[in-house]
C-alpha cells in the first residue's frame, strides 16, 4: 500500500439521525454458520504498531517455515522475503520445502518509494492462530527489494488481502484469501481490530505487545462495542468505499463530495496515515488548525515532517478536534458516520533526545491517489471485510485509545441524498500501494 509516514462532487444532506431504524448488521437476518460469535484462537493474533504495520504469524512450506507477515488490505499479493536481507531475521527457503512448486514466472512491483521483485510459485500455507486449515497458495518469493522491508519492523513478508484485479503481475494470480475460501469451508469474510498503543513502543515492547486481531471467516463480538454499520464495497479491486461528507468537530467541510473520493477512497491496513486528496487535505488542515488555535504548531508538523512534544502526561487532547467521515449506507439515502479522536490522528513517536516528553506526528497527509483510510482510521474501529456481501462494517473498537471525555464513535442513520454522485469514475489503471 503506499510507503509514507506508506510507509496521499456533491455535498449531500448530512442531517440529524433519522427517527426510523434502518436495517443493519444487528437486525435479525439469518446468517450462515460460523459467521458469528467467538474466535478465541484468533483473538490477539496480530502484533506491531501503526507506523510499521501489523503482522500475523504464518507458516509456509513442508516442513513449515514460520514467518511474520504484514496484513495489507491495500494490495493483493502474498509475497515473502526469500533471500538474505539486512533487515530480515529469517526468510523463506524454497529449497527446504518439499511442497514448493515453481511457476517459472517473475513478478516486479514498484511503489512510489521503493520496489520488490521476485519469483512466483505455490506452496502450502497456514496461519497458526487462524483457522485450522492448510491451503495451497500463490507465493511471490522476494529475491530483490528496495525500501520495502523496514528495519526493526519484525515482519518478513506481506499478505495482500484485496482483490485479484490489483494482483501483480495480473489478475490471473489468485490472491491468498480467494484460495483460502475456495479450498476450505472458511466463510468469505475477515475482520480486523488494529490496536494502537497510544504511546511509543520500543523494539522489545513491540515484540511483547499485542497489536490486535485478524478474525478469519467471522466476527468476534468481544472486539467491539455498540453496533456494526456497513458501507458497500463500490468495486472489488481495492476495498473501495464512498465518503459522502466530512466534518471537523461537527463542522461540515462543505466540499463537493466527489472531492472526498477523488480518485477513490479505500480502506488500507498497510498505510499508516489517513491520506486525503490535496483539496480535502488543505481544507481539513485549515479547519483542524482553526479548532486547535489555542496553541501554535509549526508548518512542518502539519506536513507530517516535524514532531510536537509535551511534557509527559500533559498532551492537550481537548484542544484538537474530532474528525467524522460519513460513509454511504446500505439503504438508499442513508449514511452513517465514523468519528476519530486526536488519539488516533496524532501518532506517538519516541523522542530521541529525551524520554521526559510525549511526542507526536500529525498522521493525516496529502494524497494524489485518493483517500486512504489507513491505520489511523482503523485503530479506532473493528472493521469487517464482508466480501461475501460486498460490504465493509465499522464498529467502535474495544481497544481504541481515548480519554475520559471523548470516545471514537460509529453513529447513524443519517439522511444523505444523491450519494451515488459522490463516487468518481476512474479510468482503469493498475496501481498498487505499502506502509509508509
Amino acid at each position: 500500500t503506499q510507503h509514507g509516514i506508506r510507509l496521499p462532487l456533491r455535498s449531500g444532506l448530512g442531517g440529524a439521525p433519522l427517527g426510523l431504524r434502518l436495517p443493519r448488521e444487528t437486525d435479525e437476518e439469518p446468517e450462515e454458520p460460523g459467521r458469528r460469535g467467538s474466535f478465541v484462537e484468533m483473538v490477539d493474533n496480530l502484533r506491531g504498531k501503526s507506523g510499521q504495520g501489523y503482522y500475523v504469524e504464518m507458516t509456509v512450506g513442508s516442513p513449515p517455515q514460520t514467518l511474520n507477515i504484514l496484513v495489507d488490505t491495500g494490495s493483493s499479493n502474498f509475497a515473502v522475503g526469500a533471500a538474505p536481507h539486512p533487515f530480515l531475521h529469517r526468510y523463506y527457503q524454497r529449497q527446504l520445502s518439499s511442497t514448493y512448486r515453481d511457476l517459472r514466472k517473475g513478478v516486479y512491483v514498484p511503489y512510489t518509494q521503493g520496489k520488490w521483485e521476485g519469483e512466483l510459485g505455490t506452496d502450502l500455507v497456514s496461519i497458526p492462530h487462524g483457522p485450522n486449515v492448510t491451503v495451497r497458495a500463490n507465493i511471490a518469493a522476494i529475491t530483490e527489494s528496495d525500501k520495502f522491508f523496514i528495519n526493526g519492523s519484525n515482519w518478513e513478508g506481506i499478505l495482500g488481502l484485496a482483490y485479484a484485479e490489483i494482483a501483480r503481475p495480473d489478475d490471473s494470480l489468485e490472491p491468498f484469501f480467494d484460495s483460502l475460501v475456495k479450498q476450505t469451508h472458511v466463510p468469505n469474510l475477515f475482520s480486523l481490530q488494529l490496536c494502537g498503543a497510544g504511546f511509543p513502543l520500543n523494539q522489545s515492547e513491540v515484540l511483547a505487545s499485542v497489536g490486535g486481531s485478524m478474525i478469519i471467516g467471522g466476527i468476534d463480538h468481544s472486539l467491539y462495542t455498540g453496533s456494526l454499520w456497513y458501507t458497500p464495497i463500490r468495486r472489488e479491486w481495492y476495498y473501495e468505499v464512498i465518503i459522502v461528507r466530512v466534518e471537523i468537530n461537527g463542522q461540515d467541510l462543505k466540499m463537493d463530495c466527489k472531492e472526498y473520493n477523488y480518485d477513490k477512497s479505500i480502506v488500507d491496513s498497510g498505510t499508516t496515515n489517513l491520506r486525503l486528496p490535496k483539496k480535502v487535505f488543505e481544507a481539513a488542515v485549515k479547519s483542524i488548525k482553526a479548532a486547535s488555535s489555542t496553541e501554535k504548531f509549526p508548518d512542518g508538523f502539519w506536513l507530517g515532517e516535524q514532531l510536537v512534544c509535551w511534557q509527559a502526561g500533559t498532551t492537550p487532547w481537548n484542544i484538537f478536534p474530532v474528525i467524522s467521515l460519513y460513509l454511504m449506507g446500505e439503504v438508499t439515502n442513508q449514511s452513517f458516520r465514523i468519528t476519530i479522536l486526536p488519539q488516533q490522528y496524532l501518532r506517538p513517536v519516541e523522542d530521541v533526545a529525551t524520554s521526559q516528553d510525549d511526542c507526536y506526528k500529525f498522521a493525516i497527509s496529502q494524497s494524489s491517489t485518493g483517500t486512504v483510510m489507513g491505520a489511523v482510521i482503523m485503530e479506532g474501529f473493528y472493521v469487517v471485510f464482508d466480501r461475501a456481501r460486498k460490504r465493509i462494517g465499522f464498529a467502535v473498537s474495544a481497544c481504541h485509545v481515548h480519554d475520559e471525555f471523548r470516545t471514537a464513535a460509529v453513529e447513524g442513520p443519517f439522511v444523505t441524498l444523491d450519494m451515488e454522485d459522490c463516487g468518481y469514475n476512474i479510468p482503469q489503471t493498475d496501481e498498487s500501494t505499502l506502509m509508509t
Partner: antibody, heavy 118, light 107 residues
Framework: EVKLMESGPGLVAPSQSLSITCTVS????????INWVRQPPGKGLEWLGV???????NYNSALKSRLSISRDNSKSQVFLKMNSLQTDDTARYYC????????????WGQGTTVTVSS | DIVMTQTTSSLSASLGDRVTISCRAS??????LNWYQQKPDGTVKLLIY???RLHSGVPSRFSGSGSGTDYSLTISNLEQEDIATYFC?????????FGGGTRLEIK
C-alpha cells in the same frame, strides 16, 4: 555516519542556469527531508527550499519562479536547479538535512561556492 | 515571512567570559528557535534546537533560553574553539528564516 556533500560548477555566466547536486550517505532520503541554504559573501544565511520525505517541495517565495528541487532516491542525490542567474546569486550553497525530531537542520554539507560572472 | 533580527553583528569577549547573543523574531514563534555555529572555514553545526535543547555532542557550556519573540544563546565559559559566527533560525513557519548572524571575536 551522516554525510552530505555538494558539488557544483563553480562559475556560471549571468542569465544561465545553475545545477548543484547534494549526495548523502548514512541515511535515506525517504526518511529525512533535504533543504538548500545559501550565503552570499560576507552576508547571512538564506533558506532556498526543501524536498520533503514524500517528494513534495516548498520554496522561498522570492525565488520560487527560478528554483526547482528534485531527487533520485536510488542514488541518494538531491538536485537544486536555479534559472536566470544574476551576480547577486553569487554565494556558497549548502544542502542541509532536516530532522523532524528537532525541527532543525541537524547536519550540513560543507557547501559549494558558486560565482556568477561573465 | 517571519523576520529574525540579531542586533549585534559582532561581539568581542575574552576567553573564560560568559557571552550572551540575542535574537528577536517579528512575531511569536512559540519557542521554535534554533541556533547554529558557523566556523571561519564555512562549516555549519546545529547547537541548540527548540530554544533550549542541546544537540548531541555540543558542550554543556552552550545554553539557550527565551520565549515569545525574544531569545538568547549563552556561552558560559568562552573557549578559543568557540570563535565563530552564530545564527538563529525559526522553524515555526515556512519559509524558514535566519537572523543576520553575530560574529564572536577574541579581545
Amino acid at each position: 555516519e551522516v554525510k552530505l556533500m555538494e558539488s557544483g560548477p563553480g562559475l556560471v555566466a549571468p542569465s544561465q542556469s545553475l545545477s548543484i547536486t547534494c549526495t548523502v550517505s548514512g541515511f535515506s532520503l525517504t526518511s529525512y527531508p533535504i533543504n538548500w541554504v545559501r550565503q552570499p559573501p560576507g552576508k547571512g544565511l538564506e533558506w532556498l527550499g526543501v524536498i520533503w520525505t514524500g517528494g513534495s517541495t516548498n520554496y522561498n517565495s522570492a525565488l520560487k519562479s527560478r528554483l526547482s528541487i528534485s531527487r533520485d532516491n536510488s542514488k541518494s542525490q538531491v538536485f537544486l536547479k536555479m534559472n536566470s542567474l544574476q551576480t547577486d546569486d553569487t554565494a556558497r550553497y549548502y544542502c542541509a538535512r532536516w530532522d523532524g525530531y528537532f525541527g532543525a537542520f541537524d547536519y550540513w554539507g560543507q557547501g559549494t561556492t558558486v560565482t556568477v560572472s561573465s | 515571512d517571519i523576520v529574525m533580527t540579531q542586533t549585534t553583528s559582532s561581539l568581542s569577549a575574552s576567553l573564560g567570559d560568559r557571552v550572551t547573543i540575542s535574537c528577536r523574531a517579528s512575531q511569536d514563534i512559540s519557542k521554535y528557535l534554533n541556533w547554529y555555529q558557523q566556523k571561519p572555514d564555512g562549516t555549519v553545526k546545529l547547537l541548540i534546537y527548540y530554544t533550549s535543547r542541546l544537540h548531541s555532542g555540543v558542550p554543556s557550556r552552550f545554553s539557550g533560553s527565551g520565549s515569545g519573540t525574544d531569545y538568547s544563546l549563552t556561552i558560559s565559559n568562552l573557549e578559543q574553539e568557540d570563535i565563530a559566527t552564530y545564527f538563529c533560525q525559526q522553524s515555526l513557519s515556512l519559509p524558514y528564516t535566519f537572523g543576520g548572524g553575530t560574529r564572536l571575536e577574541i579581545k
